[in-house]
Amino acid sequence: GWVWNQFFVPEEMNTTSHHVGRLRSDLDNGNNSFQYKLLGAGAGSTFIIDERTGDIYAIEKLDREERSLYILRAQVIDITTGRAVEPESEFVIKVSDINDNEPKFLDEPYEAIVPEMSPEGTLVIQVTASDADDPSSGNNARLLYSLLQGQPYFSVEPTTGVIRISSKMDRELQDEYWVIIQAKDMIGQPGALSGTTSVLIKLSDVNDNKPIFKESLYRLTVSESAPTGTSIGTIMAYDNDIGENAEMDYSIEEDDSQTFDIITNHETQEGIVILKKKVNFEHQNHYGIRAKVKNHHVDKQLMKYHTEASTTFIKIQVEDVDEPPLFLLPYYIFEIFEETPQGSFVGVVSATDPDNRKSPIRYSITRSKVFNIDDNGTITTTNSLDREISAWYNLSITATEKYNIEQISSIPVYVQVLNINDHAPEFSQYYESYVCENAGSGQVIQTISAVDRDESIEEHHFYFNLSVEDTNSSSFTIIDNQDNTAVILTNRTGFNLQEEPIFYISILIADNGIPSLTSTNTLTIHVCDCDDSGSTQTCQYQELMLSMGFKTE
C-alpha cells in the first residue's frame, strides 16, 4: 500500500525547491525498480516528484490566500513490468498560512450620522476589517480595533469594531468629526500587521439652542398717515440650530397701547412689526413695545434649553404728517328765514389744524352767489332769500391752512330757508264757469279750490268770501266747504244772455297765517242759452267755437 504523511508547504517560501514530503509504496525495497509519477493540477509546474524516490518538491512560491490546497494523484509503476504497483491514489498538499496579509476595511468609506448631545455609550457605527490570512491558523486573522483619532469624543470596542460616543458633542461647536480606526491582526502582538480606515461622523441637529435677538433695542418709525396693517419694520433673532429647529415665532410680549402686532416671515425668519391701530402724532409720538421670540418646535425633553424666551425692546417713533384742517362737525345744518336782508347771519363753521403748529384757517364757499363766509367761519347772506324759489341750499365749505394751502378739507353745509307768510292763497287753476239763462236759484255753478305757495307748519286753511260789493249786489253766492274748497251758487232765478252775457265775481281767499294774507281772485261766469235739460255743455261748445273763429247758428 501507499505510505505518506500529511503534506504541508509553507506559503511564500523564496527557495527554488522546497521538500514537501515523500510518497512511497511499502513494496518499494529501494532497488530503483519503481517509478513514481505525479498527476493533477500543479503537477510538474508547482510540484515535482523524484521518480525514483517519490520525494515531492515545491518548485515555486505559493500563496495560501490564492490557493490553500492542492489535490494531486500519485502513481507507482514497476519499471521491469510496466505495471502499476499500487492503485492510483489522490493526496492533498495543504499550503500552511503565514501572517502576510494586513487587515482591510472593505466597506469604506464609512459615514455615520448621530444626534448632537447624545449620551455616552450611544452607538454610532460598526466598522469591520477583513484579514485574508487563515482564521484557523493561530492569530494571523484575529483582529483588535483601536482608535487612532477621535478621542475624547469616541471609543471603539476592541473586538467588535463598534464605535460609541464617549463624550457629549455640540453640533454648534463642531458639526462633523473624522475618526481613524486601526485594525491589528495577531491580536496586537509583536509582528502584527495593521490597517486603518477613516469614519466621517456627522452630528445631526437637536433643538438645544433657543433663538436670541440680534439687538437688545430696535428703533422703528411709523408715519401717522400709515393705514392699519402697514409693515413698519423688521426685527431678527438668530438660532444656532438649523432646519426645523431654527424655525421661530415672534410675538408681542408687552404693548399696553395695543397698537402694534408682530407676524413671522417663515421664509426669512424675520419678525415683521405691523400697525394694528392708526397712530396720531399729536396724541402720542412714540411707543415702546417688547417682543419675544420662541422656537416653533420644541421637544419636551429639550425644554430645559428654552426656559426663558429672548426678548427685545422696540422704540417706535411716530412721524408727523401735515394733516388737513379738521372741522368740529362732519356737516352743519343752519336755518334762516326767507326775506331777511342781505348780510344776515346764517351760522358759524369751525375747523382747526390738528397739527402741533396750529396754522390759522381760511374758509371759502364753493360756487355760491347767495352766501359768503369770512375767516372766522361766519356764513352770511349776499341776497335776500325766497323760500318759494329755493327752500334748501347745499353748500360746500372749504377750510385751507394759511401756512400750507395744499392742506384742504371740505364739508357739506345745509341751509334751510324757513317760511314766512309772504304769499296769499290763490285759485289753484284758472276757472271759467257757465250758467244757463233758465237757471234756478241755488244752482251750483262751480267748485273752486285754492293753493298757497307758502309752507304751512300745520295744515293750510283757506277762507272763501265774496268781495263786499259782490256780496251786496251779487247774482251769485259762495259757500265755504271748510276743506279748502268752496262752491259758487246762483242767487236768483233766470239770467239774460243779451243783457248780461258775462259776470265777473271777485272772490276773497284768506289763509290762516300770522298775519293772515288775502287775495282777490276773479271768477268769470258766462251766461248760456241752454236746452231744456239745463245743460251748459252746448254753451261751452259754443264758447269753444267762437274762440276758434267759428259762428254757430
Epitope: 437688545s216 433695542l217 428703533r219 418709525t221 399696553d256 397701547s257 399729536e282 396724541h283 402720542q284 409720538n285 412714540h286 411707543y287 415702546g288 425692546f313 422704540k315 417713533q317 412721524e319
Partner: antibody, heavy 119, light 107 residues
Framework: QVQLVESGGGVVQPGRSLRLSCAAS????????MHWVRQAPGKGLEWVAV????????YYADSVKGRFTISRDTSKNTLYLQMNSLRAEDTAVYYC????????????WGQGTLVSVSS | EIVLTQSPGTLSLSPGERATLSCRAS???????LAWYHQRPGQAPRLLIY???SRATGIPDRFSGSGSGTDFALTISSLEPEDFAVYYC????????FGQGTKVEIK
Amino acid sequence: QVQLVESGGGVVQPGRSLRLSCAASGFTFSSYDMHWVRQAPGKGLEWVAVISYDGTNEYYADSVKGRFTISRDTSKNTLYLQMNSLRAEDTAVYYCARERYFDWSFDYWGQGTLVSVSS
Amino acid sequence: EIVLTQSPGTLSLSPGERATLSCRASQSVSNTYLAWYHQRPGQAPRLLIYGASSRATGIPDRFSGSGSGTDFALTISSLEPEDFAVYYCQQYSNSWTFGQGTKVEIK
C-alpha cells in the same frame, strides 16, 4: 463713566445767534437719542429739542420751532444747538441730556450752560 | 400738549418723615410713560424714577413711584438731608413736558 459737558453759553443781544455744544464721553454716543432742556432763572424745566441717535429725526418745542436747530457730530461725540433770532424769554440754563436706551426719560444730564439774552 | 400739575408747590418736612408728592396729567399718560427727577440748588436734575415706578440706577429704595393714567405719586419713605430739593415729574407719552416742580424743604 458717562459725562456730558455743555459749552457756548453767554450774553447775547435779542435777534442774534448762539451755538451751544455738548461734549459726550463714557458711552457709545451714536446709540443714544439726545436732548436739550432749559431752565429759566428761578423757573422749572422746559424741554427744547431732541435728535435721534443717527441724526435723521429732530423734534422741537413749539416755543423754539423755526429758530433753533439741533444737530450732532458722531465723529466728535458732540451735540449742538444752533439758536437764531434769540429773544429775552430764551434766557435760561441749557442742559443737554441723554435719553435712556430702553425708555424716553433722561438718565444723564450735563451741568448746564447759561444763555442770557438782553440788550 | 399734556400739562402736568404738581402738588403741593412746597412741602415742609423734617428728616425721617415720609413725603408724598403728587403729579396730575391733563390727559392720560400712555404706558405709564412718566418719570421723576430731583434737582438740588445749582445742580443738574437727576433721574429718580422712570416708567412711573421703576427706580433708576443707583437710586435708594426709599424712593418709590406709583400711579397710572392721569394720577401719579412719588413717595420718599424717610427723608434724608440730601433729599431736600425740587422734584419734577415728566411725561414722555407725547413729546416731553415737565411739571412746575415741588420744593421739599426742611421744616
